[in-house]
């Protein structure tokens, strides 16, 4: 019957992610009984995402290949609302790596899922970013401005933040 | 300290090509950029272009692309600008800068200069 | 490109004179302009980046202001070994641009 099938449907979507996500939390989404959303335990949720605040120190090329194999990205922050969220869960002492480099050092900021640069929704801190040696973007606290990004060389180990999409279930 | 030591002038015909020097010391070679910069005579100054001394990468002024190759020697903590097809209005003293903070250049080398004649 | 203009290609000041250099940009360059000072040997040094502040080992005569496309140098109390030729230069867009050059003479 349908309720059969559906669950059926559900623990191989499961079994999918199992691999890399052995437990997801799951909520349900609006009345309807049917629609879960998860996110890996124990990664935070907002909107349609999914956060995993990584505090092991690499390279930005590192961190971003730690994210990919989880079956995320380093975070692309898209809103202010966004960043907010995030921010709850940093610790103001550490600088994370964001999904934003310069490749080319050419001041051509991208975001590794492609979401064009839009440098009206940007939280750089005042001055920056500042160095063509300097190709990556972290996140961090400035007593005077609060969170804001800065750029840094990309060697350099930091911690991170990787997003991923809801799994619908 | 921080210093930029050029390679000293040099006197080249026209259509040739030279290979100019600059070894910096006194600080993490591969965790600064190299620039470029020449002055013609009683001129102003010409941004040529940056080497990045970590990737190895360069961004060249569309002005100059096709006459100037950049490299660099991480081994020997040494920038290198060839200039290719020299004519006569390529002399000129060309300096190495160190890349730095704020869209700057911080430290300079002492100019070397290279002069096109027949 | 952005354009960077020197109106004034020379100056000539007595010593403790303030004197003041200006720049102007073709466009706005968010404060990234910076100052350098070549002496008449052409060593070339920094004086003053991102408009207003200070290089290390550099005097504190040596001031900058300005916003948007137009900017200034500043030598408050003007001495033997400020005699050289200052340039500005834009670094907020590639290719980095220069001014044509003041150059400052005792009178």
């Known amino acids: 019957n349908f309720m059969y099938s559906k669950t059926v449907k559900r623990l191989s979507k499961l079994r999918e992610y199992q691999q890399y996500h052995p437990s997801l939390t799951c909520v349900m989404e609006g009345k309807d009984i049917e629609d879960w959303s998860c996110c890996p335990t124990p990664w935070t949720s907002f909107q349609s995402s999914c956060y995993f605040i990584s505090t092991g120190m690499q390279s930005w090329t590192k961190s971003q290949k730690n994210c990919s194999v989880m079956g995320a990205d380093l975070v692309v922050i898209n809103t202010r609302e966004e960043q907010d969220f995030i921010i709850q869960n940093l610790k103001r002492n550490s600088s994370y790596f964001l999904g934003l480099s310069d490749p080319g050092g050419r001041r051509h900021w991208q975001w590794v899922d492609q979401t064009p640069y839009n440098e009206n929704v940007t939280f750089w801190h005042s001055g920056e970013p500042n160095n063509l040696d300097e190709r990556c973007a972290i996140i961090n606290f400035r007593s005077s401005e609060e969170w804001g990004w800065n750029d840094i060389h990309c060697h350099v180990p930091q911690k991170s933040i990787c997003k991923m999409k809801k799994i619908y279930i | 300290q921080v210093q930029l030591q050029q390679s000293g002038a040099e006197v080249v015909k026209p259509g040739a090509s030279v290979k100019i020097s600059c070894k910096g010391s006194?600080?993490?070679?591969?965790?600064?950029?190299m620039h470029w910069v020449r002055q013609a005579h009683a001129k102003s100054l010409e941004w040529i272009g940056v080497?990045?001394?970590?990737?190895?990468?360069?961004n060249y002024n569309q002005k100059f692309k096709g006459k100037v190759t950049m490299t660099v020697d991480t081994s020997s903590s040494t920038a290198y600008m060839e200039l290719s097809r020299l004519r006569s209005d390529d002399t000129a003293v060309y300096y190495c800068?160190?890349?730095?903070?704020?869209?700057?250049?911080?430290?300079w080398g002492q100019g070397t200069l290279v002069t096109v004649s027949s | 490109d952005i354009q960077m203009t020197q109106t004034t290609s020379s100056l000539s000041a007595s010593l403790g004179d303030r004197v003041t250099i200006s720049c102007r940009a073709s466009?706005?360059?968010?404060?990234?302009l910076n100052w350098y000072q070549q002496k008449p040997d052409g060593t070339v040094k920094l004086l003053i980046y991102?408009?207003?502040r200070l290089h290390s080992g550099v005097p504190s005569r040596f001031s900058g202001s300005g916003s948007g496309t137009d900017y200034s140098l500043t030598i408050s109390n003007l001495d033997q070994e400020d005699i050289a030729t200052y340039f500005c230069q834009q670094g907020n867009t590639l290719p980095w641009t220069f001014g044509g050059g003041t150059k400052l003479e005792i009178k």
């Open positions: 466009q706005d360059i968010s404060n990234y």
């Open positions: 800068a160190r890349n730095g903070n704020f869209y700057v250049m911080d430290y």
């Open positions: 006194g600080y993490t070679f591969t965790d600064y950029s």
């Open positions: 991102y408009t207003s």
């Open positions: 080497i990045s001394t970590y990737y190895g990468d360069s």
